[in-house]
Every structure is written in structure tokens, then in C-alpha cells.
Interface confidence: low
């Protein structure tokens, strides 16, 4: 049985094409503003975008098993289509100006088109031929085509208004669309040629689909769903009236999803995405920032990248020739991310959420979420307010500062407490960065009227002030052990400085056009920083050859940035604290000669075995 499916903001409804009635809502909960709509006939599922919730969801035709398959990094997902052969989901986002793909369950998401894309809107797929088609509304509206892996892009119809409801007649090989500026329904061949006007007397055609000899469209002025002969535009019938703002319309029938390509068989033997390309071919695709291996089938995760956080999102950026776009990592319930770090050994992301007053960790795909540090009492005098964190990857510890207690704490990566290593009556430690290769930590101490940058051994001993003059509010620290350099940003003085790890050779790296630096990190020969007020990520070449470069702009509510370098496991294992924390029960320190010494947090003392800590 064939039936019409249409989205009408808060609900999705169906009408039998046999009886032309039975306008019934599919029983879905939580739909706010359904926009684009498609289906997978073999699975008997419908897919829709919600431009209010900024999600893509799916459910069975009876309304069961409703789930959000994409819920991060969407702004205005106006167009969406199901690749029924490769079992992929494609969507066009008018807000982010991206066309993306994922598996039907939202896994293995990749950005296919992101350059020179201006408000992409309607999207249609021809998976048997390996092409995707879309309309753009911004600048000079047009209809474009590309291979389904994003390659071979070309403009088919340049002289068109805001085209919507793009649909393909797979049998007769024609494109159909509505034009919101001219109020026409038009058609062309698959190359954009042999263009014909099907209807020119409609007040406001919007959504459109084709089935057998008919086109079906929605009209926002007539508040109707209508149909007519697809070639002549004659024999018009009103299918349903009194319908406000029908966003998308399609015919659910197996004939709309026929054909075959290589991806339909065992996913083309691809480990992640199988993407159709013309003519009748395919390529294996990888999730965003992953790279295709030499076998052209499997993918490898990125090992070198930048992470940056916004108030309620953590993003990943890679530096590559294609200038791949950054992506939002699918991590739930971020309220107010203040600081981030990364453990390259377990490939886990750590962050401080200052709204929830906790330190949490998760895999980059959002799985294995775990609260490492949490306040136990929601009282007015909050017992902990984590401010900054830094991971000692060898001992598997987090060093973190606390605004409430004004101490530096150490916690194991599994959440078990080690103890306090630095505490003083006047201390207000804030930014912190560890250098476990040398056994030191560096921190800013925002004491009243006398801010300082200090260094101490990882157990809090050997404490020394590196800088006390020429500082106002040193808010962020970064360290490069390879270069032997310390970097800091002062948000009051609006400058970025550096020195050797001993505090010698202090120089101002940048002091012009910096408004609110809040995070720093070193990545290869570049120092990256974020400017919250200018909503910008910038970098400066530390060799002095290439100067200062803007990396990203218009990113709201930036809070931190962190570079991740590939972990050399051989080097890692050579660190004396990497094997079972050097045998220490608490803190493992590297001495100048490369040997280790065990130490303890402030409330404990080292016992006679010089490995264990106990009560004094």
C-alpha cells in the first residue's frame, strides 16, 4: 500500500493514497518542529529532522522505538534523505552550511560538503547512480549535484529561486522542485537541462514529491496537499485541505526505494561508511577526522588533534590539507565546561563542568561517561569548585585546582582520591599544568594584590615563585616539555608571554589585539590560544617564521583549548613512573638523574619502605 507521509511541525501524519483519507498522526512523542522527512522501506522506519530540537530522529511506522540518531552539532537541518542501499543518512544544514552523512543509526558521522556552501536546503539522493542533489538558498540560489562522497561537485541549475521539495522521478530520470520565489513547480532532466514548468498558477507551493504518474505538493496559502499529472500539470485534485505549514511530503512505497549498488551488499566490505559514487561504484568512507587506511576499506582514528570547549560543547579539530571542518563530540549533559584535558593512553577526554561542580570523563564518542570528582553536598558553601586540571599520564593522576578550598588536589583517573599536595593560608591556585617528564607542576596563584606564577615538585615540595612582577591576572598556562618552554596568558594585561621552565628568558610573545585570552596550548611549532571576547581561535608560530594566524572565528562561549599529540608508546614506557606508578603508593617523582622517588600528599608521610604513605 502506498501512502503520503507529511510533517506538520508538531506531528507527522499519513494519508492512504488508495482511499485519499485516513489522515492519521503517527503516534510520536516530543516532536517540536518536524521539517525534513524520509523513510527506509525495508526497515519500515521513518526519519525526520526537528529544527526546534536540532535533532534527527527515527521511529517505526507505528511510532515505536523512537530515538534521536543525531543530536549534536545541528543548527537548522532543513534537508535530509535516506540512502536505502548503503543504509546511510544524508542531511543538509542551512545553519552550519554543511552536508553530512552517517549510518542510519547516526554512527560514523562525516562532513561531505562544507566549502562554498550557502544555506543548503532540500536534498535528494540517487544511490543507484551514486549522485546527490541539493538546493541552496543563500547568495545566488541554485541546484547542485555531487557524488555521494562529496566529490565531483557541479552546479546543474544556476538560474533558479529558492528551490525546495527537490525530488527525483527514478523511472523517468527527472528532477522536480518548487520555487518559493516564483511560486512555480518545475522539472528538468538529471543534468538540469530540458527544463519545464509544470505549474505556474499556484499561490505558495512548498513541499513536493513524485509517485507514478503524479506529483504531490503542499501549498501554504491554500493550506492543502494537492496532486497533478507530473508532465502536464493537469488533472489536479486536492488530497487534503485545512493543513497549516506542511513542511515536507513524500510517498512511502517500495517503488521509491529500488535499485542496487555495491554498498547494498555487505556494506561494500567497508568498516564504516560505504558511499556510492558514479557510475555504479563506491568508496569506503570514514568518520570525521578518521583516515582511510591503505587497504581502502578500514579507518584509523586521529592521533593528533586539537580539542576546544565551549560552554556546553567540546569540539575536535584536525590540521590537514583538506582543512577538514571541526566537529562537536557527542557528549551529553555539558552545562558549563570550564577546562579540558585528554589522556592519550586510554583515549579519554576529561573536563571540568563548573555548573555541576564536577570533573567528568568520557570517550570521544560520548560513551563510558564517568564522574571522576563530584561535590557531595549541594550546600551554599560548595565544598568543591574545580577550576583547572592537568593529567599526569604516567602516574595516571589528575592534578586539579579548587576555587572553594584554594588547594591543589590529586585524584586518580578512576576517581579515587590521592590527596592535597599544595595548600597555604594565602594561596589561590588557579591554572595548573604538570610536567611529569621533569617531576614538576606549574600554577598561577591569584593572591590578592600579588598574583604569581609558581613551580613546585609534583608532591608540592620545592615550591618556588617564578614570576611575581608584570602580572595582573594570569589566567591560563601551557607547557612544552620538548621545547622546555612555559607559556601564560594574562587576561587583564591582554598579553601572552613565555619563559624557560626555570623562569629564565621571559619574553612577550603577543600583546596586540588580544581581548580575553582564556586558554592556551602548544601544537607542533605553534602556540594556540582562544579569545573568548573575540570568539576566536588564533595561533602564533614560535619559530617566528610564519607569525600570527586566525584559525577559527565566530565561536561563541569559548572556554579552553588543548592539543593532543600522538603518544609514542616506547617513550611512554621508558618513563619510570609509567610502570605501576614507579611502585609508589601515592606520588611518583622523577629525579634529575632519571630515577624515581616516592612521596606523599600533605596529610600522609612516607613510610620506611620509601614506597608507601601512611598516617603521621
Amino acid at each position: 500500500e502506498a501512502f503520503l507521509l507529511f510533517s506538520r511541525r508538531a506531528d507527522i501524519r499519513r494519508i492512504s493514497l488508495e482511499t485519499n483519507n485516513n489522515n492519521v498522526a503517527i503516534p510520536l512523542t516530543g516532536v517540536k518542529e518536524a521539517s525534513a522527512l524520509d523513510f527506509d522501506v525495508t526497515d519500515n522506519r521513518i526519519y525526520w529532522t526537528d529544527i526546534s530540537l536540532k535533532t534527527i530522529s527515527r521511529a517505526f511506522m507505528n511510532g515505536s522505538a523512537l530515538e534521536h540518531v543525531v543530536e549534536f552539532g545541528l543548527d537548522a537541518p532543513a534537508g535530509m534523505a535516506v540512502d536505502w542501499l548503503g543504509k546511510n543518512l544524508y542531511w543538509a544544514d542551512t545553519g552550519t552550511n554543511r552536508i553530512e552523512v552517517s549510518k542510519l543509526d547516526g554512527q560514523h558521522r562525516q562532513v561531505l560538503v562544507w566549502k562554498d556552501l550557502d544555506s543548503p536546503r532540500a536534498l535528494a539522493l540517487d544511490p543507484a547512480e551514486g549522485f546527490m542533489y541539493w538546493t541552496e538558498w543563500g547568495g545566488k540560489p541554485k541546484i547542485d549535484r555531487a557524488a555521494m562522497d562529496g566529490s565531483e561537485r557541479t552546479t546543474l541549475v544556476p538560474n533558479v529561486g529558492r528551490a525546495n521539495g527537490l525530488t527525483i522521478d527514478y523511472a523517468k530520470r527527472r528532477l522536480y522542485w518548487t520555487d518559493l520565489d516564483t511560486n512555480l513547480i518545475e522539472s528538468s532532466n538529471m543534468l538540469g537541462l530540458n527544463r519545464e514548468v509544470i505549474a505556474d498558477d499556484l499561490p505558495h507551493p512548498f513541499g513536493l514529491t513524485q509517485y507514478q504518474d503524479y506529483i504531490y505538493w503542499t501549498d501554504w496559502s491554500r493550506r492543502s496537499i494537492e496532486r497533478a499529472n507530473k508532465t502536464s500539470g493537469q488533472n489536479r485534485t486536492i488530497i487534503q485541505g485545512h493543513l497549516d505549514y506542511v513542511m515536507d511530503i513524500l510517498v512511502f512505497h517500495s517503488s521509491r526505494q529500488s535499485g542496487w549498488n555495491e554498498c547494498a551488499s555487505s556494506n561494500g566490505h567497508c568498516s564504516h561508511l560505504c558511499l556510492a559514487v558514479p557510475v555504479g561504484g563506491f568508496v569506503c568512507g570514514c568518520p570525521a577526522h578518521y583516515s582511510l587506511n591503505a587497504d581502502n576499506r578500514t579507518c584509523s582514528a586521529p592521533t593528533t588533534f586539537l580539542l576546544f570547549s565551549q560552554k556546553s560543547a567540546i569540539n575536535r579539530m584536525v590540521i590537514d590539507e583538506q582543512q577538514s571542518p571541526d566537529i562537536i563530540l557527542p557528549i551529553h549533559s555539558l552545562r558549563n565546561v570550564r577546562a579540558i584535558d585528554y589522556d592519550p593512553l586510554d583515549k579519554q577526554l576529561y573536563w571540568i563542568d563548573s555548573r555541576q561542580n564536577m570533573i567528568r570523563k568520557a570517550q570521544e564518542d560520548g560513551s563510558q561517561g564517568f564522574t571522576v570528582v563530584v561535590s557531595s553536598v549541594p550546600s551554599q558553601n560548595l565544598e568543591i569548585q574545580p577550576y583547572d586540571l592537568s593529567i599526569d599520564i604516567y602516574s595516571r593522576y589528575i592534578y586539579w585546582t579548587c576555587e572553594a578550598t584554594n588547594v591543589i588536589n590529586v585524584t586518580r583517573l578512576d576517581g579515587r582520591s590521592v590527596g592535597v599536595v599544595l595548600k597555604g593560608e594565602q594561596d589561590r591556585p588557579r591554572a595548573v599544568v604538570v610536567n611529569p617528564e621533569k617531576g614538576y607542576m606549574y600554577f598561577t596563584n591569584l593572591q590578592e594584590r600579588s598574583p604569581k606564577i609558581e613551580r613546585a615538585a609534583l608532591d608540592g615540595t620545592e615550591r618556588e615563585v617564578l614570576f611575581f612582577s608584570g602580572l595582573s591576572k594570569p589566567i591560563a598556562l601551557a607547557l612544552d616539555s620538548r621545547l622546555g618552554k612555559l607559556f601564560w596568558a594574562d587576561s587583564d594585561l591582554r598579553r601572552i608571554e613565555s619563559s624557560d621552565l626555570s623562569g629564565a628568558n621571559r619574553i612577550v610573545l603577543e600583546d596586540s589585539n588580544i581581548l580575553q585570552p582564556v586558554g592556551l596550548t602548544v601544537f607542533e611549532n605553534w602556540l594556540y590560544w582562544i579569545d573568548k571576547q573575540q570568539q576566536m581561535i588564533e595561533k602564533i608560530d614560535m619559530t617566528g617564521r610564519e607569525g600570527r594566524t586566525k584559525v577559527q572565528a565566530r565561536i561563541a562561549q569559548l572556554s579552553d583549548i588543548h592539543a593532543v599529540k600522538e603518544l609514542n608508546l616506547q617513550e611512554y614506557r621508558q618513563h619510570p613512573c609509567a610502570q605501576d606508578n614507579g611502585g609508589c603508593s601515592h606520588i611518583c617523582l622523577v629525579k634529575g638523574d632519571g630515577t624515581t622517588r616516592c612521596s606523599c600528599p600533605m596529610h600522609l608521610v612516607l613510610l620506611q619502605d620509601e614506597l608507601s604513605c601512611g598516617e603521621p
Partner: antibody, heavy 119, light 108 residues
Amino acid sequence: QVQLKESGPALVKPTQTLTLTCTFSGFSLSNRGGGVGWIRQPPGKALEWLAWIDWDDDKSYSTSLKTRLTISKDTSKNQVVLTMTNMDPVDTATYYCARMHLPLVFDSWGQGTLVTVSS
Amino acid sequence: DIVLTQSPATLSLSPGERATLSCRASQFIGSRYLAWYQQKPGQAPRLLIYGASNRATGVPARFSGSGSGTDFTLTISSLEPEDFATYYCQQYYDYPQTFGQGTKVEIK
């Protein structure tokens, strides 16, 4: 100790705007981590969260009512004000203000003020 | 919005009996993002449990909370006369935070 008190009109006509003030003591909205929320309860019915505001002026509103609600704070006066436009008889309820704590629980409440919407 | 469904709507028990109140979320809300409140007629609600299982200050040990994901339970091990009231659960996993419709614990 922490105290909160709601004040505002007991009777409002349909289509009018309701303005409620929460005056509190025992804590400050200039301290990180604190916030004040509004919750209402129609007679004989369940609690319904309306809005909150916190120390850094972050605001959140009920999805169904956000077009009608505005929340603001006056830190120096220890007051939070909620306005609700286009009142309707179904908005008749006891309106509570409460101190909100991370992580977003209400640990101290005012005694509530009954607002009746009727012509 | 996340919908919280409390059951039963009414629980009729005698003092000294054990009360088990259920709160089910329409979607995953983690293990730490549920609170329970007690409300007596004519009074404002009072926070009992936060973080699913932590007792608020001054709450007797006979009140305990458990659960994670979508299913949560408030248990009163032995009902005292002052425990007869209406109990509400609240989720704060996702905005907007929402309350359940309440369970009334009445004297049998």
C-alpha cells in the same frame, strides 16, 4: 539561616501581566554556585518548574511557557523578579520561589503565594 | 521535555510499614540527576534526596533513594506519622528540569 519570601498580587485579571518578587536572605546571588528558581502548583495538582536564574545571570525557562516568562535579579537587594504575561485562569496556582543549588536542586523554599486569575 | 511518571498515585499504608515509591523517566537521566521532595498540605515542598541517593541535611535515615538510568525509587523503611504526605521526584539531567505528578502516601 536561609529564608525566601514571595510577594505579588493575589488577584490578576485575564490577559494582564503578573509580576512576582522573591526576597531572600541567608545567601547571596553574587556568590558562585547559587541561584533562585520559581515553581508553581495549581490547586490540588503537581509542581511545575517555571524558571531559574543563577549567579552569572544564566537563565532557563520552562519550554511551554518561555514566550511568556522573564526572570531577572537585583543582587544588591537580594531579589529575583518573575514576570508572566497574558495571564489566564489556568495560571491560577501557588507560586513558590526556591534557592537553587548545584546541581540544580531546590534546597530551601518560600512559603508560596496564591495567585488567582479571574475577571 | 523529559517526562517523569510516578507510581502509584496513592499509597495507603500504616505507620511502621515500609513505603516504596517509584519514579520512571521517559528517557535516560543518568545516575546522579534525580531529587525527591516531600510536601505536606498547606506547606512548601522540602528537599529529601538529591543525586538519586544522597540525603539532604536533616533528613532522617529512614529515607533512602536508589536507581539509575530511567528507574528510581524512594524508600521509607518504617513510616512515622509525620511521613504521610505527597512526594515528588524531579530530574535535572536535562533542561528544562521537570517534576513527576506526585505520589500521595496516606494513612490506611
